[in-house]
Interface confidence: low
């Protein structure tokens, strides 16, 4: 069964910069991948951005660098000014489109305990949902 | 250059529903983001919401959240604005705009605009 | 939701005078804001973007200054094609526009 998981970073020298990283553990080819915050896209949530593998990028302020890491991972970097800046607890969803498995959708958010700059390995998210 | 070109004129009763259209010619239309505002008579300009045609997905202002749909048919390189629930105070110009960035910066703007809709809501 | 609060909401100059409109972000944007200039009937026109860039084919005698939550637009010599109405937008999330100002011929 495909996996999506999230890891979530606050940098070290920006308090208000945060690093989101995705990916997708499946055998199928990603055809897009959609990140939000405050909850999954069409759910509440806010895109943050859009990476499609052809196509190319496209981010929503307050996200400054998206990018592909691997075939299967993303990240994207948060800049936040005032009114943008994520809260500790802030939620950032991962949507995975991919043929032949479909939508694949996982949360995460920085955790309790974190220091800027440090986090724990990224695990697979529950999977929210799959289309 | 990118051209938008906007649906014609509506006028709509109250209650009822309106679907306005914005076709983008000579540039790319999938990669950018399509945004609407409004501007009601002798009034500012408000941002409804936008979308992003290469995944179809749409963020909206608080305001007008359940009530505005934003979809996009990158086939025809055409952005739709449909908002429910009419009523008199929806009377205003409707605008479709790209919404332009420049590289990996997070500095975004309107450029260009459609030459906009108007509608009407009147019993 | 982040507002932005334009002054004055109108005013009258001359041919030649040189105008300051200012726009206030309700928190602190950056430098994520656009002004735009709107005639009557005919669709808004990017002038300036991230606060200060010149939008291609705007004549210099516009600029745009300032970061946080206080901007300013001003045209060092008013044209005759510069009576108009004027939004400031802000991009820091999402986005907002100013509620106007009309610059009208005295």
């Known amino acids: 069964t495909p996996e999506v998981w999230v890891q979530v970073r606050m940098e070290a020298t920006e308090l208000s910069s945060f690093t989101i990283r995705c990916g997708f553990l499946g055998s199928g080819s990603i055809s897009l991948v959609t990140v939000s915050w405050g909850g999954p896209n069409g759910a509440g949530g806010t895109t943050l951005a859009v990476l499609h593998p052809e196509r190319g990028i496209r981010q929503w302020a307050p996200a400054r660098q998206a990018r592909w890491e691997t075939q299967s991972s993303i990240s994207l970097i948060l800049e936040g000014s005032g009114a943008s800046s994520p809260c500790a607890n802030t939620t950032f969803c991962c949507k995975f489109a991919s043929f032949p498995e479909g939508s694949w959708e996982a949360c995460g958010s920085l955790p309790p305990s974190s220091d800027p700059g440090l986090s724990a390995p990224p695990t697979p998210a529950p999977i929210l949902r799959a289309d | 250059q990118v051209q938008l070109v906007q649906s014609g004129a509506e006028v709509k009763k109250p209650g009822s529903s309106v679907k306005v259209s914005c076709k983008a010619s000579?540039?790319?239309?999938?990669?950018?983001?399509i945004s609407w505002v409004r501007q009601a008579p002798g009034q500012g300009l408000e941002w409804m919401g936008g979308i992003i045609p290469i995944s179809g997905t749409a963020n909206y202002a608080q305001k007008f959240q359940g009530r505005v749909t934003i979809t996009a048919d990158e086939s025809t390189s055409t952005a739709y604005m449909e908002l429910s629930s009419l009523r008199s105070e929806d009377t205003a110009v409707y605008y479709c705009?790209?919404?332009?960035?420049?590289?990996?910066?997070?500095?975004?703007?309107?450029?260009?605009w459609g030459q906009g809709t108007l509608v009407t809501v009147s019993s | 939701d982040i507002q932005m609060t334009q002054s004055p909401s109108s005013l009258s100059a001359s041919v030649g005078d040189r105008v300051t409109i200012t726009c206030r972000a309700s928190q602190s944007i950056s430098s994520y804001l656009n002004w735009y200039q709107q005639k009557p009937g005919k669709a808004p026109k990017l002038l300036i973007y991230a606060a200060s860039s010149l939008q291609s084919g705007v004549p210099s005698r516009f600029s745009g200054s300032g970061s946080g939550t206080d901007f300013t637009l001003t045209i060092s010599s008013l044209q005759p094609e510069d009576f108009a109405t004027y939004y400031c937008q802000q991009s820091d999330i999402l986005y907002t526009f100013g509620g106007g100002t009309k610059v009208e011929i005295k």
């Open positions: 705009a790209r919404d332009t960035g420049r590289g990996y910066t997070r500095h975004f703007w309107f450029d260009p």
């Open positions: 000579g540039g790319t239309f999938s990669s950018y983001a």
